[in-house]
Amino acid sequence: MMTGTIETTGNISAEKGGSIILQCHLSSTTAQVTQVNWEQQDQLLAICNADLGWHISPSFKDRVAPGPGLGLTLQSLTVNDTGEYFCIYHTYPDGTYTGRIFLEVLESSVAEHGARFQIP
């Protein structure tokens, strides 16, 4: 039975040109995390495998940095980076857990004068 839960940073905002950390946390289970996939809509950004380490998709390697921890750092943000991001935890023996983060990338002036979402 899958008893675990995924906690995420939820809805977050960041300035165009800046960077943001995406974090998810798996709790309430004793399952072993074998791999975490980070995806944007249907695109794979990165994989963190417990045995093999990090793999960053070639198309994102200049703007995605691994970590901290199992998280992912997005750099040089553009307005096109606005959207849904998913952390997919592959665990044994539970199976797969998925967390969702919505990122809104704002023009600098907009972010300075009251973003719709607050960074936790």
Partner: antibody, heavy 116, light 107 residues
């Protein structure tokens, strides 16, 4: 098996610099972070910084910004840490470790002694 | 920086007893806490990762729990070889930080 090899000891004079190595084997060097940790005699563990061999990205504990420099030689799967302007406060054991946020493999540590 | 406070500083117990160490973070770190054991003159050894995940080769008497700001390392039925220093470490944000450590002495 996965191993991190470090030289046992370095004796250096005050004001000088030292560059210590950490040679990795048994895994793909470019996919795991290499971390450096300081431990003064009888004291706790202090994280210095990390470096990601796949891209050369570094992060530092601000306390070590002007003290430590982390570099790589990916061709030999070796990470390096240089410590500059050494004082007695830098006398310590320095560990390298492999990590994904957690540090699952540790070297035996390099004991740095700063003495004239 | 995230501050990790460990307690107790020193614990002295007899073999067979159950012991617990506390690690409190200055802000929420989710489940991004690791526990390490360091015996005298040895390198640290990873015991628990991400709050509760067990590590291959580590005896099952070691377990971790907690999330947010409060974490616990428990040793069920302590053995003499468990005499060591124990450290927690957070990987929620750079710079990563360690707690000050807890010493376990076996009577």
């Amino acid at each position: 098996q996965v191993q991190l090899q470090q030289p046992g000891a370095e004796l250096v004079k005050p004001g000088a610099s030292v560059k210590m190595s950490c040679k990795a084997s048994g895994y793909t060097f470019t996919t795991f972070w290499i971390n450096w940790v300081k431990q003064r005699p009888g004291q706790g563990l202090e994280w210095i910084g990390d470096i990601f061999p796949g891209r050369g990205i570094t992060n530092y504990n601000g306390k070590f910004n002007n003290k430590a420099t982390l570099t790589l030689d990916t061709s030999s799967s070796t990470a390096y840490m240089q410590l500059s302007s050494l004082t007695s406060e830098d006398s310590a054991v320095y560990y390298c470790s492999r990590g994904l946020g957690y540090f699952d493999v540790w070297g035996a540590g390099t004991t740095v002694t700063v003495s004239s | 920086d995230i501050l990790l406070t460990q307690s107790p500083a020193i614990l002295s117990v007899s073999p067979g007893e159950r012991v617990s160490f506390s690690c409190r973070a200055s802000q929420s770190v989710g489940t991004s806490i690791q526990w390490y054991q360091q015996r005298t003159n040895g390198s640290p050894r990873l015991l628990i990762k991400y709050g509760f995940e067990s590590i291959s080769g580590i005896p099952s008497r070691f377990s971790g729990s907690g999330s947010g700001t409060d974490f616990t390392l428990s040793i069920n039925s302590v053995e003499s070889e468990d005499s060591a220093d124990y450290y927690c470490q957070q990987s929620y944000r750079w710079p990563y930080t360690f707690g000050g450590g807890s010493k376990l002495e076996i009577k």
